[in-house]
């Protein structure tokens, strides 16, 4: 028998520095977690103690904090090189700055293979990107070889900016021939490493013949055997065992997100490459693990540029940006409009001639808007200003909901109106009218939404049975502020870009902004 240790991360999302327990900015260092300096300590400790170790990343290193905003992926290559990752799969967010924003900072600089079997380049891009990412890689580990085959969510064109010269094929269809190729090369230990979410990970384990282990990402799935060490609730045991169609037991793993845990899976293979046993658990990277001085010093060095960036002007406002709770928790506020407009603008994807865009709607809890921005400071808007407005380090995500769920959400928005509570919704691509004289749960008297399957966008009444795409904060997607109906009834959820980054990019693009209060939210006569 031969034993392999698989260390894995996924959805790190630019958390190079240690974070608080909820993966936001570290405040009390003695209680902080994760970060590449701490990860390095643990990885080196395991590498010293065990002979056959692979360190793998299942995608979405890009996007999530000011680190990515400023360094644009150079930080990912630098620190992943320092940690000597053995392989990485491409995630959807690796395309957030377009194909060039992937090629130059990461693909050309990485000292490890970057993989995806289901992304096919065409046209002029094919020769430019050739060899920079691979469908698979055979890695020597001790006296054996291990094949790693990559995959990426086929939804990437709707979630990011891969352009028109990359085709995202069905994962299972694309993976099978690559695994077959590895088998003909006498590689009998094969790991599928990818970024399509836990459901697809399980399908790959079930359907792709020859895959021995699946290491996934995208869905931020936390698996654990025994008593979990922090706040995350396990979605199943680690590893999650799938019985393949050809009768094999295939371990499937994922390690939550944000570099909070290091996935740790031990696999025992027989001489024919069959998995005999698999066991392990994610390791919580808490403060009991010291940060490595060499990596931490490098982090401190790179950090300086971030501090300078936060005070630089992104653009100007010529109007007061009203982000006060007195406004945003009671009525339409222009800060809410600005943020929602930025959210929609960030999700412009012309992937189908029938649609002007795949999504037109935004909702945003007023309680998530934490500060106004005064225009009387020469109109200057900085990252620092935006961090006061959106201090929670969240993301603006894409969900699919039925019209009936949206109606419930808008009823919840005003079910206890007047108490300055955070659930009052700011909107984009939606016209809502409330009648507060009616009883809670029956106060939405008009709800019109902007069409997407149209050449001239216009507002049509919401249809209860229709499925709509909506951009909203991850806080709402997870049921925050009492929006349990969104969490319970959503049909699809894909994590998006860092909230501040979305707004800062929009302001930089527009250069001068002047958002107005324009009648998106109305109260019927006599009730307000």
């Amino acid at each position: 028998a031969w034993e392999l240790t698989i260390l894995h991360t996924n959805d790190v999302h630019s958390r190079l520095e240690q974070t608080s327990e909820d993966s936001s900015k570290c405040v009390n260092a003695s209680r902080c977690m994760g970060g590449v300096a701490r990860l390095f300590t643990k990885v080196q400790q395991i590498r010293r103690a065990e002979p056959n170790v692979l360190l793998l990343d299942a995608g979405d290193q890009y996007q999530g904090t000011i680190w990515f905003t400023v360094y644009k992926g150079a930080e990912v290559a630098h620190f992943m090189n320092a940690l000597r990752y053995d392989a990485m799969a491409l995630g959807n967010h690796e395309f957030d700055n377009g194909v060039e924003g992937l090629i130059e900072p990461l693909l050309k600089e990485a000292k490890f293979p970057i993989l995806s079997a289901n992304i096919k380049a065409k046209g002029p891009l094919a020769s430019q990107i050739s060899g920079l990412y691979l469908p698979y890689k055979v890695l020597p580990v001790g006296d054996e070889v291990v094949g790693i085959v990559g995959y990426t969510s086929k939804e990437t064109p709707f979630l990011s900016n891969p352009g028109t010269n990359l085709v995202f094929e069905d994962e299972i269809t694309a993976l099978q021939p690559e695994v077959d190729k590895l088998k003909t090369l006498n590689v009998n230990k094969i790991i599928a490493l990818g970024h399509s979410g836990f459901e697809m990970d399980k399908l790959i384990a079930q359907k792709v013949r020859g895959v021995d282990v699946v290491v996934g990402g995208h869905s931020n799935t936390f698996l654990y055997t025994g008593n979990p060490p922090s706040k995350e609730v396990p979605a199943g045991k680690y590893p999650f065992i799938v019985t393949s169609d050809d009768g094999r037991k295939v371990p499937v793993v994922q390690a939550y997100a944000f570099g909070k845990y290091l996935g740790y899976l031990k696999i025992e293979f027989d001489e024919r490459g069959n998995v005999i046993s698999s066991h392990g658990n994610p390791i919580l990277l808490n403060s009991s693990i010291p940060e490595d001085p060499s990596i931490k010093a490098d982090i401190n060095k790179w950090r300086i540029k971030l501090d300078n960036y936060s005070t630089q002007e992104l653009g100007k406002t010529i109007v007061y940006l009203d982000g006060s709770s007195q406004s945003c928790r009671f009525r339409e506020c222009n800060m809410g409009n600005l943020i929602c407009d930025a959210m929609i603008n960030n999700n412009l994807r012309h992937t189908d001639e029938m649609f002007w865009n795949h999504v037109s709607m935004c909702i945003l809890n007023g309680g998530g808007i934490r500060s106004p921005i005064d225009e009387r400071n020469n109109g200057t808007i900085t990252w620092e200003n935006l961090a006061a407005v959106l201090p929670f380090g969240g993301t603006f995500d894409l969900v699919q909901l039925k019209g009936s769920t949206l109606k419930k959400a808008f009823e919840h928005s005003v079910h206890r109106y007047g108490q300055s509570t955070g659930e009052f919704l700011q909107v984009g691509g939606i016209h809502v009218v409330y009648d507060l004289s009616r009883k809670p749960g029956d106060r939405v008297v008009k709800l019109d939404v902007l069409c997407t399957k149209c050449r001239v966008p216009s507002y049509d009444p919401l249809k209860m049975d229709e499925v709509y795409k909506v951009i909203l904060p991850n806080f709402l997607a997870n049921g925050g502020d009492g929006f349990q109906m969104i969490k319970d009834e959503l049909l699809r959820h894909d994590s998006g870009d860092q909230d501040i980054n979305v707004v800062s990019t929009y302001i930089s693009k527009m250069k001068v902004i002047y958002p107005a209060v324009e009648g998106r939210i109305k109260f019927s006569t006599g009730s307000h």
Epitope: P51, A82, R84, K111, P293, S294, A297, D298
Partner: antibody, heavy 120, light 111 residues
Framework: EVQLVQSGAEVKKPGESLKISCKAS????????MNWLRQMPDKGLEWMGR????????HYSQKFKDKVTITAHKSSSTAYLQWSSLKASDSAIYYC?????????????WGQGTTVTVSS | DIVMTQSPASLAVSLGERATISCRAS??????????MNWYQQKPGQPPKLLIY???TQGSGVPDRFSGSGSGTDFTLTISSLQAEDVAVYYC?????????FGGGTKVEIK
């Protein structure tokens, strides 16, 4: 178990060429830098240079630049230090030592040393 | 290049007693919040072994009696209770920048 095994002692004449080796095992060879250091009889230690076995990128101390060449062979997990023309002053013990691939990292594992004697 | 000066050149200490070795750098070896001073132990006929890195962090498997301190240019290696197996030459080394440089060594013997 991490091991760096160096080639045996060498006795050479001035002007001759020499290539000594350091075979790594117990870890992923391409995951760390390999450094070469010199220790002259009853003297301290001097860092000569390093190689990144992943892409063969090298970095030399100015003192040893153009005097020695550091190479690595990925498939055999072996690093090499070579001279094209030895001098009597090259007589010393030469060590290979591993370090994490970041500038400020220490030398965490060392080979047993190769004694080179250059004498006419 | 950063010049490292160790003192004393040799040191005789009774078993169980404290041994203290000093190392001074010609310029600061501090780098973004850390001091990159490392200490190695070399026994006769053996290669050096890492004891302490980044001024105060113990190397893997190093006994607790070895500790390091200091910042900037002045550093100390302390053996809290000298054991017979600690007889060796001890070297300091800076890894702030290349070329990495070593002190001349301190020979520790039993009194």
């Amino acid at each position: 178990e991490v091991q760096l095994v160096q080639s045996g002692a060498e006795v050479k004449k001035p002007g001759e060429s020499l290539k000594i080796s350091c075979k790594a095992s117990g870890y992923t060879f391409t995951g760390y830098w390999m450094n070469w250091l010199r220790q002259m009889p009853d003297k301290g230690l001097e860092w000569m240079g390093r190689i990144d076995p992943y892409d063969s990128e090298t970095h030399y101390s100015q003192k040893f630049k153009d005097k020695v060449t550091i190479t690595a062979h990925k498939s055999s997990s072996t690093a090499y230090l070579q001279w094209s023309s030895l001098k009597a002053s090259d007589s010393a013990i030469y060590y290979c030592a591993r370090s994490s691939p970041i500038t400020t990292a220490p030398f965490d594992y060392w080979g047993q040393g190769t004694t080179v004697t250059v004498s006419s | 290049d950063i010049v490292m000066t160790q003192s004393p050149a040799s040191l005789a200490v009774s078993l169980g007693e404290r041994a203290t070795i000093s190392c001074r750098a010609s310029e600061s070896v501090d780098y973004y919040g850390f001091s990159f001073m490392n200490w190695y132990q070399q026994k006769p006929g053996q290669p050096p072994k890492l004891l302490i890195y980044a001024a105060s962090t113990q190397g893997s498997g190093v006994p607790d009696r070895f500790s390091g301190s200091g910042s900037g240019t002045d550093f100390t290696l302390t053996i809290s209770s000298l054991q017979a197996e600690d007889v060796a030459v001890y070297y300091c080394q800076q890894s702030k920048e290349v070329p990495y440089t070593f002190g001349g060594g301190t020979k520790v013997e039993i009194k």
